[in-house]
Interface confidence: low
């Protein structure tokens, strides 16, 4: 089993749609279960500390350049939710996301109809197959939602930011 999220970071605009892509290949002939899981930032991207002191985060970050204070912390220190899961052709939304325009398309891509402020964070695409347990079964993408127009939005490459008409 091999799971790949092609975009490691996605920047999109508030109230606009986005698609988080996920590809997988498997030797299994059984239908795969696709699950998208959301993990909030360990600290607020806009600077306020959430769950971990920024001073501690920065000192740890200095010692280990691979450690990211925004993304790397125990799940107990941040919000973790199931966004949606798909088995066969049936898509089920997590409790927190019920009523939202969210679905799983093209086998494993997460489609969000209208982004909200709280959608910024880390999204994990997790694939489970009953008879292919070897390899990598998950990958992640960071989604950063910007509530901006003008220069900042326009300079984002089209494959990273999506600004679509209502």
């Amino acid at each position: 089993l091999q799971v790949t999220v092609p975009d490691k970071k996605k920047v999109a605009m508030l109230f606009q749609p986005t698609v988080l892509r996920c590809h997988f290949s498997t030797s299994s002939h059984q239908p795969a279960v696709v699950q998208w899981k959301f993990k909030s930032y360990c600290q607020d991207r806009m600077g306020e500390s959430l769950g971990m002191s920024s001073t501690r985060a920065q000192s740890l970050s200095k010692r280990n350049l691979e450690w990211d204070p925004y993304l790397d912390c125990l799940d107990s220190r941040r919000t973790v939710r199931v966004v949606a899961s798909k088995q066969g052709s049936t898509v089920t939304l997590g409790d927190f996301y019920r009523g939202r325009e969210i679905t799983i398309v093209h086998d494993a891509d997460l489609q969000i109809g209208k982004l909200m402020w709280g959608d910024s964070g880390l999204y994990y695409c997790i694939i489970t197959t009953p008879d292919d347990l070897e390899g990598k079964n998950e990958d992640s993408v960071e989604l950063l939602v910007l509530g901006r127009t003008g220069l900042l939005a326009d300079l984002l490459p089209s494959f990273a930011v999506e600004i679509m008409p209502e």
Epitope: K8, K9, V11, R45, M46, G47, S54, Q58, S61, L65, D68, Y70, L71, E142, R148, T149, G150, L151, L152, A153, D154, L155, L156, P157, S158, F159, A160, V161
Partner: antibody, heavy 131, light 108 residues
Framework: EVQLVESGGGVVQPGRSLRLSCAAS????????MHWVRQAPGKGLEWVAV????????YYADSVKGRFTISRDNSKNTLYLQMNSLRAEDTAVYYC????????????????????????WGQGTTVTVSS | EIVLTQSPGTLSLSPGERVTLSCRTG???????IAWYQQKPGQAPRLLLY???NRATGIPDRFSGSGSGTDFTLTISRLEPEDSAVYYC?????????FGQGTRLEIK
């Protein structure tokens, strides 16, 4: 080695035109937004213009709007600044600068990283507007 | 456009000392869009920090940044002779990009 080399500066009379070039090497030029920043003699830095990675979006400082045009040729790895109706106050060293990739925040690539500053600068080319 | 005001304008300190440079923005700026640069005489600027507090590649850990809203700071914990330079803060905004007027740091 990542490098930016500006050229095209010189002495020009007020009201005339000049075209600056910035040759890029050592990185995938077509993936990054590019800026022009200038510095008048003995003064601070002043941002002039920015162009998106593919040239489709351009923004200018109010002081140059309508007179300067930023453009790029990704096939030649070159950034340009066409300066028309030059004024004495345009006298400055002109730097081209590259958007920074998101160093240290994960392996993110090829997206506009205004979040991360300008990480590579040329050595500058001097423009003097004088009669 | 957002105006950035840096203080002090000039300061002179000795090697080994700690210094904090201030950058105040005319209106609230998300700290994701604040950067600091160092410029030595006759040279191009050099990126020090982005996102208000993240060090750029190759920048020693003597340099650190903090702040939010309208007040941002650059701190150099142990001054070295080579830190003598002008330091600029910079912000990205929808309306454009602006730099502060700079703080000149002299090492005695």
């Amino acid at each position: 080695e990542v490098q930016l080399v500006e050229s095209g500066g010189g002495v020009v009379q007020p009201g005339r035109s000049l075209r600056l070039s910035c040759a890029a090497s050592g990185f995938t030029f077509s993936s990054y937004g590019m800026h022009w920043v200038r510095q008048a003699p003995g003064k601070g830095l002043e941002w002039v213009a920015v162009i998106s990675y593919d040239g489709s979006n351009k923004y200018y400082a109010d002081s140059v709007k309508g007179r300067f045009t930023i453009s790029r040729d990704n096939s030649k790895n070159t950034l340009y600044l066409q300066m028309n109706s030059l004024r004495a106050e345009d006298t400055a060293v002109y730097y081209c600068a590259k958007e920074s990739p998101s160093v240290g925040l994960g392996s993110y690539y090829d997206f506009w990283s205004g979040l991360y500053g300008m990480d590579v600068w040329g050595q500058g080319t001097t423009v003097t507007v004088s009669s | 456009e957002i105006v950035l005001t840096q203080s002090p304008g000039t300061l002179s300190l000795s090697p080994g000392e700690r210094v904090t440079l201030s950058c105040r923005t005319g209106q609230r700026v998300e700290n994701l869009f604040i950067a600091w640069y160092q410029q030595k005489p006759g040279q191009a600027p050099r990126l020090l920090l982005y996102g208000a507090s993240n060090r750029a590649t190759g920048i020693p850990d003597r340099f650190s940044g903090s702040g939010s809203g309208t007040d941002f700071t650059l701190t150099i914990s142990r001054l070295e002779p080579e830190d003598s330079a002008v330091y600029y803060c910079q912000q990205y905004d929808d309306s454009g990009i602006t730099f502060g007027q700079g703080t000149r740091l002299e090492i005695k």
